[in-house]
Interface confidence: low
């Protein structure tokens, strides 16, 4: 009776509720970059405001006809997904549309720059309240595009862009390749990829997260009552706009950084089935499905972290490949993944007065990936403590040593092309948790943290017999911050986290045979914030009424004649 | 945007006494580069971003736009400044011939050139 | 002029179904949500739901979601709303009202006549 | 659910009497977009359909006479009948529409 995908985007325990109040969201502007709209549907009207802005090119071919059903079909039917009475997500959320997209849903990187440009002089005439801008639009890979939207997400706006429909690697296309853009892929209702005719959803390390994309029913241009279902990344963006809307209404003050944390946090884990996606993406795709938090407040207390994959390195020998945090992001753990298994560690090192996560190529190797573990951690002072590989065999250790300082991540590096089978005790020596523990020709590099009230305990699995994957997972009430493997030995891939799960990967069984070395241990590093627990104690202690849980209950809905179309 | 067409002459004319000599010279060792979609059927020749370096005031804008108009005349070609950014990113949107790339990018204050090229609705 | 005229009044046994249509002349079906409202002898005004001609989307009241059905025929203007599993407690008498599709119009400016519905054994 | 508590139950009053009939909300009836408490007011007589009044509070529909008006904001509202009309006895409801609908128990105001 409800349509699958608001069920989808709704918490589970508020699925018996029938309704939605009409202010969701109502403290949010969405820009919609898009076709011209039907702004008068019924489903919009009164919601949406048309701006004079309009940037597009001619239509191709002598015999096009515009017919203004056809010109607005794209635009309308996203901004009754974003905030449609009915079929909306965010039903309180006033809309502003500027027409980028022809009538044959094309335009160019120019239009939808001078676009850009004119929501953040908007912006700077007439300051608002959070603004999300949502392109559900790509082209090619655009360095212009790309920073164009990095200014504006750095003037305070969330921008949220489609993944593209091409099943291919996202990074290949613009705007979903920028890093500060929320970069949204599309899933159907059997949480599977979105297969669209010989096509898809696309993937990889540049989306961020899924949301419903398939036989998604909005409004129709047809005429001011009719409703259609659509198909695409388009409509799967429009969700998470929506689901932006909802939460920076409930929670204005929230910045990108957090907003995109709580969107991962909040989102259903491991339910796409990988299968879908080409073998050498699936581990740099999120699987992760959009959803809206269960309420307001409470999620204030959490340490939120997020993985970061970096572009692959390449085959050369000394190539590096860097993955970096959002500007206020902590890089808490560094680590290093490679098919081959031939690589060199990680480390982390200052870069711009930041840390970053780099990742070192060895000889014969195909690439490798660094791993950047990112999470909001306010009032955190973070530094590297870095040990030189060890004279002895008992391998190389480094600790925290300042006063208040945890360790929250363990990163290795070797300049050997071989680290060989010798391996340094698994086991700390007791009553030393704030150390990381390395081969003899590494150098060890541990990521010291202060913040307020942050504590965090290593956690060890180890598999005596070889074995392809390794997991360690953090308990409830605790985040990953660092995933790393023990030993450092050349039959380890590299270590990777996967929500809060730290994942080691080794060679196949078969190659390593079953010796001794194919002994491995992963080891995370969880922790939390007692500190943010008690300021969000005191934040709801303070606050009446109870957010989210009202604003967004599913609706019951009984459906008749609706058409499918495809975009 | 206004159609610029009728005041192209007169303007051209303006600038003809511009000298190359006068404006700053880019700075040594920086060398802006050219980028354009991967995607070839997707790429829109003729139609160039020209991306400014991040602290350059609208004027610098406007006179490094002014300039490229200036001296594509002087070799004889047509250009049209469609549009000049700021408050995002500074610099300009150009009408010109491929030709003039090489010319654009030695232009002061020029960080980076990109061909325009198509997006479409997902 | 703007009308809705409900059926006629039932009698009905426990256990039973009751279907209760409401027509409507005079004004553009779609354009208006239809909703059903209740009142038990001496007693107060009970919202049981909606539903919205255009999109046949529903909402239903906690207290009914089981037992009510509420559809259109858009080509006769008309609306339904069918309630299941009759207890005494239903003997009521049902309203239509309507309701502008837009944002800030959130009041019934259009009622029915009423359709009384007995349930007696 | 948002729960409506109407005051009195009912009351008996005299033609040309300036009457009140309070209706309180169980939470805040201000749509934050829009800027209106989405509170009506209905009137309705025995054996008839309940007809419209007040809507977002104190807007009065087309036709409703000048005497009946309607204030507040927030959680707490106001029906005043200035000058009453022999017509004006009847039941009269409260209705909330921000959260589902939800009406008051009902005011019967009789002849004293």
């Known amino acids: 009776s409800i349509p699958w995908n608001l069920e989808r985007i709704t918490p589970p325990r508020y699925r018996a509720d029938e309704y939605q109040p009409p202010d969701g969201g109502s403290l949010v502007e969405v820009y919609l970059l898009d076709t011209s709209i039907q702004s008068d549907h019924r489903e919009i009207e009164g919601r949406v405001m048309v701006t004079d802005f309009e940037n597009v090119p001619e239509e191709d071919g002598t015999r096009f006809h515009r017919q203004a059903s056809k010109c607005d079909s794209h635009g309308t039917h996203l901004a009754g997904v974003v905030s449609g009475r009915d079929a909306g997500v965010a039903k309180g959320a006033s809309m502003r549309s500027l027409r980028v997209l022809n009538c044959q849903g094309k335009g160019t990187v120019s239009g939808t720059l001078i676009g850009l440009e004119f929501i953040r002089k908007s912006q700077l005439v007439q300051p608002v309240g959070p603004l999300v801008v949502l392109l559900p639009l790509a082209g090619g890979y655009s360095r212009v595009l790309n920073a164009a939207c990095q200014r504006l997400a750095r003037a305070g706006v969330v921008l949220v862009t489609a993944a593209g429909n091409f099943r291919d690697d996202a990074c290949l296309y613009s705007p979903a390749s920028a890093p500060e853009v929320i970069t949204v892929g599309a899933t159907n209702a059997q949480d599977q990829p979105v297969t669209l005719g010989t096509l898809g959803t696309n993937f990889g390390r540049c989306v961020d997260l899924f949301a419903p994309g398939e036989d998604i029913i909005g409004a129709s241009s047809d005429c001011s009552t009719c409703f259609v279902s659509q198909s695409g990344t388009s409509q799967a963006a429009a969700h998470v706009a929506g689901i932006a809307a909802m939460m920076l209404s409930a929670e204005p003050e929230l910045t990108l950084a957090e907003l995109r944390q709580r969107l991962i946090h909040f989102s259903a884990k491991d339910v796409i089935n990988e299968a879908w996606f080409p073998e050498d993406q699936r581990v740099l795709t999120p699987n992760l499905v959009a959803a809206l938090p269960p309420s307001t407040h409470g999620a204030g207390w959490q340490l939120f972290c997020r993985t970061v994959w970096s572009a692959h390195s390449g085959p050369t020998r000394m190539a590096t490949a860097v993955a970096r945090c959002a500007p206020d992001e902590e890089l808490l753990s560094c680590s290093s993944f490679s098919r081959s298994g031939k690589r060199r560690g990680e480390r982390m090192e200052a870069q711009g007065g930041k840390l970053v996560c780099r990742a070192h190529n060895a000889f014969g190797g195909e690439g490798v990936y660094a791993i950047a573990r990112c999470c909001l951690l306010p009032q955190a002072n973070c530094s590297v403590h870095t040990a030189p590989p060890a004279e002895a065999s008992m391998g190389t250790r480094v600790h925290c040593h300042q006063q208040g300082h945890v360790l929250t991540g363990c990163s290795s590096h070797w300049e050997v092309e071989d680290l060989g089978t010798h391996k340094p005790p698994v086991l700390r020596p007791r009553g030393q948790p704030n150390q990381c523990v390395g081969h003899r020709e590494a150098s060890i590099h541990a990521s010291c943290c202060h913040a307020p009230g942050l504590e965090c305990k290593v956690k060890e699995h180890g598999i005596p017999a070889p074995q392809e994957q390794v997991t360690v997972a953090c308990e409830e009430g605790w985040t990953l911050t660092g995933c790393s493997a023990l030993p450092g030995t050349s039959h380890v891939l590299g270590a990777y986290a996967v929500d809060n799960t730290c994942v080691v990967r080794s060679r196949d069984v078969s190659t390593t045979g079953s010796t001794s070395e194919g002994a491995v241990t992963a080891v995370a590093i969880c922790c939390r914030s007692r500190h943010l627990a008690q300021a969000s104690q005191e934040l709801q202690g303070s606050t009446s009424g109870s957010g989210l849980n009202d604003i967004f209950e599913a609706q019951k809905i009984e459906w008749h004649e609706h058409h499918h179309h495809h975009h | 945007q206004e159609d610029e067409d009728g005041d192209y002459e007169e303007l051209v004319l303006a600038l003809r006494s511009e000298e190359d000599g006068l404006a700053e010279a880019p700075e040594h060792g920086t060398t802006a580069t050219f980028h354009r979609c991967a995607k070839d059927p997707w790429r829109l020749p003729g139609t160039y971003v020209v991306v400014l370096k991040e602290e350059t005031h609208l004027s610098q804008s406007e006179r490094t736009a002014r300039r490229l108009q200036a001296q594509a005349a002087r070799r004889g070609y047509l250009t049209k400044i469609l549009h000049v950014f700021h408050g995002l990113l500074p610099g300009f949107l150009v009408k010109m011939s491929g030709d003039l790339l090489e010319l654009a990018l030695k232009l002061p204050h020029v960080d980076y050139i990109e061909e325009d090229s198509s997006v479409f609705a997902q | 002029q703007v009308q809705l005229v409900q059926s006629g009044a039932e009698v009905k046994k426990p256990g039973a179904s009751v279907k209760v249509s409401c027509k409507a002349s005079g004004y553009t079906f779609n354009d208006y949500w239809m909703h059903w409202v209740r009142q038990a002898p001496g007693q107060g005004l009970e919202w049981m739901g909606y539903i919205n001609p255009s999109s046949g989307f529903t909402k239903y009241h906690q207290n009914f979601k089981d037992r009510v059905t509420m559809t259109r025929d858009t080509s006769i203007s008309t609306a339904y709303m069918e309630l299941s599993r009759l207890t005494s407690d239903d003997t009521a008498v049902y309203y239509c009202a309507r309701q502008y599709d837009y944002d800030e119009d959130w009041y019934f400016d259009v009622w029915g006549q009423g359709t009384t519905v007995t349930v007696s054994s | 659910d948002i729960q409506m508590t109407q005051s009195p139950s009912s009351l008996s009053a005299s033609v040309g009497d300036r009457v009140t009939i309070t209706c309180k909300s169980s939470?805040?009836?201000?749509?934050?977009?829009?800027?209106?408490?989405?509170l009506a007011w209905y009137q309705q007589k025995p054996g008839k359909a309940p007809k419209l009044l007040i809507y977002w509070a104190s807007t009065r529909e087309s036709g409703v006479p000048s005497r009946f008006s309607g204030s507040g904001s927030g959680t707490d509202f106001t029906l005043t009948i200035s000058s009453l009309q022999p017509e004006d006895f009847a039941t009269y409801y409260c209705?909330?529409?921000?959260?589902?609908?939800?009406f008051g128990q009902g005011t019967k105001l009789e002849i004293k």
């Open positions: 209705k909330q529409s921000f959260n589902l609908f939800t």
């Open positions: 939470q805040s009836l201000l749509n934050s977009r829009t800027r209106k408490n989405f």
